[in-house]
């Protein structure tokens, strides 16, 4: 019997300071290139090593970015979303949605890592 996969969705405000090479991540998504079916949202596709986002540590690949400096990212073309990030200020505030996968085993199931009583 397989366990059920649930998702724990949390939101976080992440304030990044632009480093010498910028914010340091890539995005996918937008109304013209949906990354998730029936969702035109903007998602983090890559965190660049030693970039501002990586050094901060909170932004993760797969996170959905809801807004930049208070500006909603809904219903934007991909390139318009990219422009919004590139042309934002030195201090950038991101509203981010983290989606954490939670594995729920059936009742009475003891996972391999569980200590035996």
């Amino acid at each position: 019997m397989n366990g059920r996969v649930d998702y724990l969705v949390t939101e976080e405000e992440i304030n990044l300071t632009r480093g010498p090479s910028g914010l340091g991540f890539n995005i996918v998504g937008g109304t013209d290139q949906q990354y998730v079916s029936n969702d035109s949202g903007i998602y983090v596709s890559r965190i660049k090593e030693n970039g501002a986002a990586a050094l901060d540590g909170r932004l993760q690949e797969g996170d959905k970015i809801l807004s930049v400096n208070g500006q909603d990212l809904k219903n934007l073309l991909h390139q318009d979303a990219v422009d919004l990030f590139r042309n934002a200020g030195y201090a950038v505030s991101l509203r981010v949605q983290h989606r954490l996968q939670v594995q729920n085993g059936p009742i009475g199931h003891r996972g391999e890592g569980d200590p035996s009583g």
């Epitope: 914010l23 991540f25 995005i27 890559r46 991909h78 390139q79 990219v82 990030f85 590139r86």
Partner: nanobody, 120 residues
Framework: HVQLVESGGGLVQAGGSLRLSCQAS????????MAWFRQAPGKEREFVAA????????YYADSVKGRFTISRDNAKNTVYLQMNNLKPEDTAVYYC??????????????WGQGTQVTVS
């Protein structure tokens, strides 16, 4: 590799005008988005204006709207910044930035060395 070379900076009186140019050279440049940023002494680098094609978009910082105009000549791989009615607070080093058109990075890929603009 792409090189960006700015020119056109200088000393101008308040109310005067300057036209900055930035030429992109290098085999890999593909007429992607280009922008101007500036950095005043003791301050952080700030966005001034940007231009993109496909679909065409032009953006300005609120502080320069109505005074500065960004344009580009794709045949020459050059972007211009026409600056009118200059104010002392426009004094800064002006930097050109460019990105490859297919880049999904939220950062500009290339930066110039900057050109000084001083408004007295």
């Amino acid at each position: 590799h792409v090189q960006l070379v700015e020119s056109g900076g200088g000393l101008v009186q308040a109310g005067g005008s300057l036209r900055l140019s930035c030429q992109a050279s290098g085999r890999t440049f593909d007429s992607g988005p280009m922008a101007w940023f500036r950095q005043a002494p003791g301050k952080e680098r700030e966005f001034v204006a940007a231009i993109r094609r496909s679909p065409e978009r032009i953006y300005y910082a609120d502080s320069v709207k109505g005074r500065f105009t960004i344009s580009r000549d794709n045949a020459k791989n050059t972007v211009y910044l026409q600056m009118n009615n200059l104010k002392p607070e426009d004094t800064a080093v002006y930097y050109c930035a460019a990105a490859l058109s297919r880049s999904t990075s939220v950062d500009y890929d290339y930066w110039g060395q900057g050109t000084q603009v001083t408004v007295s």
